[in-house]
């Protein structure tokens, strides 16, 4: 393992597809992949009138957008389906939405909003 890199070996698993069929498939997914590829965890969810509806959680495979992210944070502004990925065992247990504001005029007192966390 490379020093400073969080190896992902397992992730929280949830799949709404299966839940609809009452197969109760929720738990811990072991992550597999090529030795030279990185493995990540992810979460994807919808925000329906303020209510969080998880769609899927599990392992994600080698994606530069997930490299060295210890927290699962969606940064896109108002996506239809929220998605975040991270590195480290079970790092997708908690996920958050923290949109990156496109600041045109810097304010004298910039405020960093605290991201809402879901789990």
């Amino acid at each position: 393992a490379i020093l400073g890199r969080s190896e992902t070996q397992e992730c929280l698993f949830f799949n709404a597809n299966w839940e609809k069929d009452r197969t109760n498939q929720t738990g811990v997914e072991p992550c597999y992949g090529d030795k030279d590829k990185r493995r990540h965890c992810f979460a994807t969810w919808k925000n329906i009138s303020g209510s969080i509806e998880i769609v899927k959680q599990g392992c994600w495979l080698d994606d530069i957008n997930c490299y060295d992210r210890t927290d699962c944070v969606e940064k896109k502004d108002s996506p239809e389906v929220y998605f975040c990925c991270c590195e480290g065992n079970m790092c997708n247990e908690k996920f958050s939405y923290f949109p990156e504001m496109e600041v045109t005029q810097p304010t004298s007192n910039p405020v960093t909003p605290k991201p809402p966390y879901y789990n």
Epitope: F13, N15, D21, N24, Q25, E29, T44, V55, G58, L61
Partner: antibody, heavy 120, light 107 residues
């Protein structure tokens, strides 16, 4: 590297059942996601259902609900697909396939396929 | 059920050409879109998963893009072994569904 080896070709009568096996080797079978996909001659691909052996319960495409049963035997690392009430339209090559992840990112390893012919 | 459509249904091209195949989903599938190549008498082969990730061992001339309902597979600098049928597949919601296929033929 996982390998999937399927049972041989079958010829069946309309109204009967067929059970196709798929033996996995090369990794922890119970933590694979195994799907069954079929392809009628000269036609496209059709997903029938899938199973994670560790959970034991399968998810089926509505079209096959009640007619297909997907099971897994962890002791022999073998998955099975049984299709009942066969009709001529069920003539197809049946593939067992491993998915990259439990959330189904892509079907990366395919068995060699089992030809099932339904004919009177 | 999510219906997948592909265009064109067939196309002719020459070695060295760049071709693009389009896949559309009847409703959003986020990034849960894969591309497969199939040759006669053989099982399909995974090329692209998660809309744009290249599967192990697949040449870099294959690339995928898109999200939601509109996806593309691009093959640059076509090689003789690339002439085959290509399928897209969504696995966002069950039943997982495939496109009808695009047959790529030598001009």
């Amino acid at each position: 590297q996982v390998q999937l080896v399927q049972s041989g070709a079958e010829v069946k009568k309309p109204g009967s059942s067929v059970k196709v096996s798929c033996k996995a080797s090369g990794r922890e079978f119970e933590s694979l996601f195994i799907s069954w996909v079929r392809q009628a001659p000269g036609q496209g691909l059709e997903w029938m259902g899938g199973i994670i052996p560790i959970y034991g319960t399968a998810n089926y495409a509505q079209k096959f609900q009640g007619r297909v049963t997907i099971t897994a035997d962890e002791s022999t690392s073998t998955a099975y697909m049984e299709l009942s009430s066969l009709r001529s339209e069920d003539t197809a090559v049946y593939y067992c396939v491993k998915d990259l992840t439990w959330t189904n990112l892509g079907l990366d390893i395919w068995g060699q396929g089992t030809m099932v012919t339904v004919s009177s | 059920e999510i219906v997948m459509t592909q265009s064109p249904s067939s196309l002719s091209a020459s070695v060295g050409d760049t071709v693009t195949i389009t896949c559309r989903a009847s409703q959003g599938v986020s990034r849960w879109l894969a591309w497969y190549q199939q040759k006669p008498g053989k099982a399909p082969r995974l090329l692209i998963y998660a809309a744009s990730s290249l599967h192990s061992g697949v040449p870099s001339r294959f690339s995928g893009s898109g999200s939601g309902t509109h996806f593309t597979l691009t093959i640059s600098s076509l090689q003789p072994e690339d002439f085959a049928t290509y399928f897209c597949q969504q696995s966002y919601s069950t039943p997982f569904t495939f496109g009808p296929g695009t047959k790529l033929e030598i001009k």
